[in-house]
């Protein structure tokens, strides 16, 4: 839970020629008030519900009477903030409409008359708990300057107001698995309490008291496995009694995306990829220009190139989509070589390299042998970020410093005796055996049971053994 706060700084003629006439006159004094309407930017409710996140109306401003012959100045404003409380999580991306209304205070029969002077709209990305964001919007010849922020109501904290904070029970530290609540370091994150009985394995909650099921599970406590074997279709609302998915329309059936948008299914709903010039959950918002601030995430808005797109968003690195609304998973392209770990920091990509590799993309194989010496005539061999020594005969160990006993591994078969030799080892075979390792039995008739032709030898070649 929390509150969206809007502070109107000024409302008056915009820059440039064609200043608007004052909305009030000596004959018709008037006063202004404002209405704000908020919708969750990417939620399903955005299209149908008028102000799904909430709406607020300001107080009336001071009565204003135009000075004859004077251009319309910035008009007197109502005092105070417009506050829109929200009960659930703050969505992060939201759409707003701010309307400037005129209340005429002349001698109208039936009380004051209201008329809409200007309406501005836009979509913004905003984290709860952040600083005031300033904005300027133009509507015709009028210009509205305002600031806004979203703040969480205790005990909620975090950029979406979904984490809960409680005063510490112990003065020194928080309970197991619970972090201190920044910036309120004297408070601790409170565990989120899901609905009683909610399956800890197959259920989760984003709000206290709810129980939402992971894919493949259903029922009020997410304890019923979804069985599709006896179902006609693996889609549709689940039946809590059978745990079977009742056939139903897919989220993209009938293409809910307007104005040529293309639909793709998501685990919980659908997503429209809108053509240029359109946005909204169903690509239903059009007639948008750069004045409406349609580019998110620091995208630069410039004019469109087609009659059906009044603007183009030039996205900063890491974002894409016709409104820069989609974060690019740049790590999915696996830019880090040689097993490096990819980290997308938003403003840049970083590769954390394995030992033995370096460079922005871990593309450089460090010289593992640099400064490494292999003793006793051994040669250094690079590989996989570590060096190893290929040792000369008679030596072993990591750096070839150990004198090897070639007979230690008992290489001579069938009771043969092993002798260490400067060039390696020699086997003295027991009677009835022959071969370099005494591996071949000698038959009584003098023929040996040698293989027909060892690899690399043709039949008939002389076969020499030590």
């Amino acid at each position: 839970a929390g509150v969206f706060e809007l502070q109107i700084h000024s409302f008056g003629p915009g820059p440039g020629p064609g200043a608007p006439r004052s909305p009030c006159s000596a004959r018709l004094p008037c006063r202004l008030f404002f209405r704000v309407c908020l919708k969750p930017g990417l939620s399903e409710e955005a299209a149908e519900s008028p102000c799904a996140l909430g709406a607020a109306l300001s107080a009336r401003g001071p009565v204003y009477t135009e000075q004859p012959g004077a251009p319309a100045p910035d008009l007197p404003l109502p005092d105070g903030l417009l506050q829109v409380p929200f009960r659930d999580a703050w969505p992060g991306t939201f759409s707003f409409i701010i309307e400037t209304w005129r209340e005429e205070l002349g001698d109208q029969i039936g009380g004051p008359a209201w008329s809409l002077l200007a309406r501005v709209a836009g979509r913004r990305r905003l984290a709860a708990g952040g600083p005031w964001a300033r904005d300027i919007q133009r509507a015709g010849a009028w210009e509205l300057r305002f600031s806004y922020r979203a703040r969480c109501e205790p005990p909620a904290v975090g950029t979406a107001c979904t984490r809960l904070c409680r005063p510490r029970s112990a003065p020194s530290r928080c309970g197991p698995g619970l972090r201190p609540c920044a910036p309120l370091e004297d408070e601790c994150e409170a565990p989120l309490v899901c609905r009683a009985g909610c399956s800890p394995e197959h259920g989760f909650c984003e709000q206290p008291g709810e129980c939402r099921c992971l894919e493949g599970w259903t029922g009020p406590l997410c304890t019923v496995p979804v069985s599709t074997s006896s179902c006609l279709s693996p889609r549709g609302p689940s039946s809590a009694t059978t745990g079977c998915l009742v056939p139903g329309p897919g989220p993209c059936d009938g293409n809910p995306c307007a104005n040529g948008g293309s639909c793709s299914e998501t685990p919980r709903s659908f997503e429209c990829t809108c053509p240029r010039g359109f946005y909204g959950l169903r690509c239903e918002v059009s007639g948008v220009t750069c004045a409406d601030g349609p580019c998110f995430n620091g995208g630069l808005c410039v004019g469109g190139a087609d009659p059906d797109s009044a603007y183009i968003c030039h996205c900063p690195p890491g974002f894409q989509g016709s409104n820069c609304e989609k974060r690019v998973d740049r790590c999915s392209l696996q830019p880090c070589r040689n097993g490096g770990l990819c980290l997308d920091l938003g403003h840049a990509l970083r590769c954390r390299c394995r030992a033995g590799f370096a460079g922005p993309r871990c593309e450089h194989d460090l010289d593992d042998c640099a400064g490494r010496a292999c003793a006793n005539g051994g040669t250094c061999v690079e590989g996989g970020g570590a060096h190893r020594c290929s040792c000369a005969l008679g030596f072993g160990g990591r750096d070839c410093r150990e004198r090897a006993d070639p007979c230690a591994a008992r290489p001579c078969a069938h009771g043969g005796r092993c002798y260490a030799h400067f060039s390696g080892l020699v086997c003295a075979c027991a009677p009835g055996y022959m071969g370099a390792r005494c591996e071949f039995p000698v038959h009584p008739d003098g023929a040996s049971a040698l293989p027909a032709a060892p690899p690399g030898l043709r039949p008939g070649d002389p076969q020499r053994y030590l």
């Epitope: 750069c290 630069l300 808005c301 410039v302 004019g303 469109g304 190139a305 087609d306 030039h314």
Partner: antibody, heavy 115, light 107 residues
Framework: EVQFQQSGPELVKPGASVKISCKAS????????IHWVRQSQGKSLEWIGL????????VYNQKFKSKATLTVDNSSTSAYMELRSLSSEDSAVYFC????????WGQGSTLIVSS | DIKMTQSPSSIYAFLGERVTITCKAS??????LSWFQQKPGKSPKTLIY???RLVGGVPSRFSGSGSGQDYSLTISSLEYEDVGDYYC?????????FGGGTKLEIK
């Protein structure tokens, strides 16, 4: 009638800078991007970048980012492109244009860089 | 950057002949493609935008088609005044990029 009037030919020395102007008329200047395009002798067209007079937004082709600076003066409905550190490779005809569906182009400004 | 490969680089055709020029993008450009005609010593003139929409005042013998990566400009019956250079331009993504051009001449 929509028109773009560009400044005349320029002969400059290597290392120098030059500023080409493009005066727009016949439409609401702030409503459309102004693009700049280069055409070297006997070559194809190259997009340098655009500027949106409404909000001053500029998008450069990275290839020209250190070469060109785009500006506008809304009061005179004029767009400008300054080219710096010129070399003989920058000798070309430079066009300003409204590269939208109607596609209006200036007549081109010839730049010759020679010592 | 998206690379636009235009072919052929030159065409010699008879008057009244049907002429087709193609442009291939290095990735899907979602029909954000224009065709331009440029006569010697003149500025380019836009013929087609959004792959197949004819600019007002352009003769109907010019037509554009294509989608995804492959696009073409067709002149149904070549006339003498159609001589010149033709370029495609993709405007799906910054930086905008032009094809290498096609020189069209009469046989």
């Amino acid at each position: 009638e929509v028109q773009f009037q560009q400044s005349g030919p320029e002969l400059v020395k290597p290392g120098a800078s030059v500023k080409i102007s493009c005066k727009a008329s016949g439409y609401t200047f702030t409503d459309y991007n102004i693009h700049w395009v280069r055409q070297s002798q006997g070559k194809s067209l190259e997009w340098i970048g655009l500027i949106y007079p409404f909000n001053g937004g500029i998008v450069y082709n990275q290839k020209f980012k250190s070469k060109a600076t785009l500006t506008v003066d809304n009061s005179s409905t004029s767009a400008y492109m300054e080219l710096r550190s010129l070399s003989s490779e920058d000798s070309a005809v430079y066009f300003c244009a409204r590269l939208n569906w109607e596609g209006y182009w200036g007549q081109g400004s010839t730049l010759i860089v020679s010592s | 950057d998206i690379k636009m490969t235009q072919s052929p680089s030159s065409i010699y055709a008879f008057l009244g002949e049907r002429v087709t020029i193609t442009c291939k993008a290095s990735q899907d450009i979602n029909s954000y493609l224009s065709w331009f005609q440029q006569k010697p010593g003149k500025s380019p003139k836009t013929l087609i935008y959004r792959a197949n929409r004819l600019v007002g005042g352009v003769p109907s013998r010019f037509s554009g088609s294509g989608s995804g990566q492959d696009y073409s400009l067709t002149i149904s019956s070549l006339e003498y005044e159609d001589v010149g250079d033709y370029y495609c331009l993709q405007y799906a993504e910054f930086p905008y990029t032009f094809g290498g051009g096609t020189k069209l001449e009469i046989k």
